[in-house]
């Protein structure tokens, strides 16, 4: 439940303007996302670690395009939408659809934003109206974060700044990508 | 009409805690970035924390495990728990809507006077 | 993380066009992040007047434009006004894209 207040629940999908996709809700439950059926791994995992840069998560690859008002993208953009649980690396499948997602029964890890990008796009505008460009932010890598609790447990320290620098030494994850990437118009977010 | 009203600015005593409020109006809260940007008193702008639309957080160096944003997509309200407050934390707090890697909005501020 | 600097104070008589210079520098002295320019008057909040180093939101007057060159970002003010007086900050984001800085600020006095 600690995650849901994290997330603020912002899962609504509807059409917006500006820069960022909500997660869409399905991904909550998506088959592609390989969690275990069983609800996780046994307890005294041989590969459970306390060390974050030994586990992976999910990059989902999504295409929209970017509105503001009336005006759209001539282009859709890719990003990545972090989500799913983060299991240790050498668990983790190469392809989407194959094999067990692996669960934590203990530590609190979840696939975060890693690294943003910024984007220049052209967007288009109806009645004749001159093309408007706008620099997008849009996500580029995610990484595994592990997630400390407050007292209270009703909310989860931050990331800080250094959570999406790109860390030099650190060894590349494995990403899972969908056979071909998802399109779809998700609610934009600035 | 894009609104922000912030509140909960007020006197308090070095290593004490304050809560700020931040109303928004007027747009679709839960699809913006959203920042707390602070002045102090006769000094420039700087940057404190903002907020993602999905509720990831990023600090300043300054206020990083003194200070924690938040927000509330159900009463389009964003926050700033203000803790082991300092001196120098004196100013008037800003929050701003992010879009578009720039501050379009801007509410009037509310003064935070740390003091004994 | 890039840090800014802006001429303390630039004054000009009403009629007259003023440049405000915004420099980068940062570890790696190049092309700045897209720079925002905000005006401040004296008790208000900030207004955003440039974005994207050169677009002005509706209702800016077309008397404010911006440009930058290398590490320089710059804000003109042409035909300059009474009203123009204030103070103006350039700002930036930060490599992550998570973070902002801003110049120190410059005071524009109109003579």
């Known amino acids: 439940q600690g995650w849901q207040a994290f997330k603020n629940d912002a899962t609504e999908i509807i059409p917006e303007l500006g820069e960022y996709p909500e997660p869409p809700p399905e991904l909550e439950n998506n088959k592609t996302m390989n969690r275990a059926e069983n609800g996780g791994r046994p307890p005294h995992h041989p590969f459970e670690t306390k060390d974050v840069s030994e586990y992976s998560c999910r990059e989902l690859h999504f295409t929209r395009y970017v509105t503001d008002g009336p005006c759209r993208s001539a282009k859709p953009v890719t990003e990545l939408v972090c989500s799913g649980q983060c299991g240790p690396a050498r668990l983790l499948p190469n392809a989407i659809g194959r094999g067990k997602w692996w669960r934590p029964s203990g530590p609190d890890f979840r696939c975060i934003p890693d690294r943003y990008r910024a984007q220049r796009v052209q967007l288009l505008c109806p009645g004749g109206e001159a093309p408007r460009a706008r620099k997008v932010r849009l996500v580029a890598s995610c990484k595994c974060k592990r997630l400390t609790r407050f007292h209270n447990q009703s909310e989860l320290k931050d990331f800080g700044t250094e959570a999406a620098r790109p860390q030099k030494g650190r060894k590349p994850r494995p990403r899972a990508r969908s056979a071909k990437a998802n399109q779809a118009e998700l609610e934009n977010a600035y | 009409q894009v609104q922000l009203v912030e509140s909960g600015g007020g006197l308090v005593q070095p290593g004490g805690s304050l809560r700020l409020s931040c109303a928004a109006s007027g747009f679709t809260f839960r699809s913006h970035w959203l920042s707390w940007v602070r002045q102090a008193p006769g000094k420039g702008l700087e940057w404190v924390s903002v907020?993602?639309?999905?509720?990831?957080?990023y600090y300043a160096d300054s206020v990083k495990g003194r200070f924690t944003i938040s927000r509330d997509n159900s009463k389009n309200t964003l926050y700033l728990q203000m803790n082991s407050l300092r001196a120098e934390d004196t100013a008037v707090y800003y929050c701003?809507?992010?879009?578009?890697?720039?501050?379009?909005?801007w509410g009037q501020g509310t003064l935070v006077t740390v003091s004994s | 993380d890039i840090a800014l600097t802006q001429p303390a104070s630039v004054s000009g008589s009403p009629g007259q066009s003023i440049t405000i210079s915004c420099t980068g520098t940062?570890?790696?002295?190049?092309?700045?992040?897209?720079v925002s320019w905000y005006q401040q008057h004296p008790g208000k909040a900030p207004k955003l007047m440039i974005y994207?180093?050169?677009n002005r939101p509706s209702g800016v007057s077309n008397r404010f434009s911006g440009s930058k060159s290398g590490n320089t970002a710059s804000l003109t003010i042409s035909g300059l006004q009474a009203e123009d007086e204030a103070d103006y900050y350039c700002s930036s984001y930060g490599e992550s894209l998570t973070s902002y800085v801003f110049g120190g600020g410059t005071k524009l006095t109109v003579l």
């Open positions: 701003a809507r992010d879009t578009y890697l720039h501050f379009d909005y």
């Open positions: 907020t993602t639309h999905q509720g990831y957080t």
């Open positions: 940062s570890s790696d002295v190049g092309d700045i992040n897209d």
């Open positions: 994207d180093v050169n």
